[in-house]
Amino acid sequence: MMTGTIETTGNISAEKGGSIILQCHLSSTTAQVTQVNWEQQDQLLAICNADLGWHISPSFKDRVAPGPGLGLTLQSLTVNDTGEYFCIYHTYPDGTYTGRIFLEVLESSVAEHGARFQIP
């Protein structure tokens, strides 16, 4: 039975040209995390394999940085980065857990940042 839950940064906003940390946290399970995929609807941004380390898709290599932890830092944001992002936790023996983050990239210099992510 899958007992885990994923906590995410939820809906966040950031300024064009700035950077943002996408962060998820899996809790309430003893399952082993084997891999975390960071994805948009139709493409892979990055993979963090617990054993093999990071893979970053070439189209994002110049503006995505791995971490902190299993999170992902998006840099040099453009309005085209607005949209849904998914953290997909591959675990054993539970299976797959998915978290969703909505990022809005604002033209304005007064972008209101969502509450900072905290792991309780």
Epitope: T34, Q35, N37, E39, D42, Q43, L44, I47, N49, A50, D51, L52, G53, W54, H55, I56, S57, P58, S59, K61, P66, H90
Partner: antibody, heavy 119, light 107 residues
Framework: QVQLVQSGAEVKKPGASVKISCKTS????????LHWVRQAPGQGLEWIGG????????SYAQKFQGRATLTVDTSTSTAYMELSSLRSEDTAVYYC????????????WGQGTLVTVSS | DIQMTQSPSSLSASVGDRVTITCRAS??????VVWYQQKPGKAPKLLIY???YRYTGVPSRFSGSGSGTDFTLTISSLQPEDFATYYC?????????FGQGTKLEIK
Amino acid sequence: QVQLVQSGAEVKKPGASVKISCKTSGYTFTEYTLHWVRQAPGQGLEWIGGINPNNGGTSYAQKFQGRATLTVDTSTSTAYMELSSLRSEDTAVYYCAGSGYYDYSFAYWGQGTLVTVSS
Amino acid sequence: DIQMTQSPSSLSASVGDRVTITCRASQDVKNAVVWYQQKPGKAPKLLIYSPSYRYTGVPSRFSGSGSGTDFTLTISSLQPEDFATYYCQQHYSTPFTFGQGTKLEIK
């Protein structure tokens, strides 16, 4: 330039073990993940597993879990693959392959090591 | 495990022909697919990755496309040195798996 040079051909009896080396040069050893792939005569490519020289983390295909052991020696920039309890079906060319920085594509390949298992 | 199925298994073509090889994943692998070329007695060589980027030194006649479960490798105008076996591979999740290969032969 990046080079992966493997040890020479081996002939082994069923039940024995074989250990193949892959000496790397031309890059910082701990930056690239190293994988092992095999190819039986006339057959396709099969991923055995990979190792991250930075932390020694290993990932194996289920089929080889417990029978293959991947290790590295960072002092000599060399990776090793040991396969135990050999059987005739393990007769194959074994390749080491390196994937680049933050990348899982196998950009660099050794020349291959033929392992023949025969009684 | 994710299965990668290539078609066709073998293909006869002539120099100058346009050739397309397809690869289908058993589940969504986004854009985490690469293509290799292998000649007899030699190690494979990386051709295309992610899945439309040509690796360094690969001629522009090679191109890749696709996302999700369906991927293609296209050679726009076959050259004599292109006759080889081609493999797709997914690296979306371990174990990394290869297609069974497509052998491209001279007609």
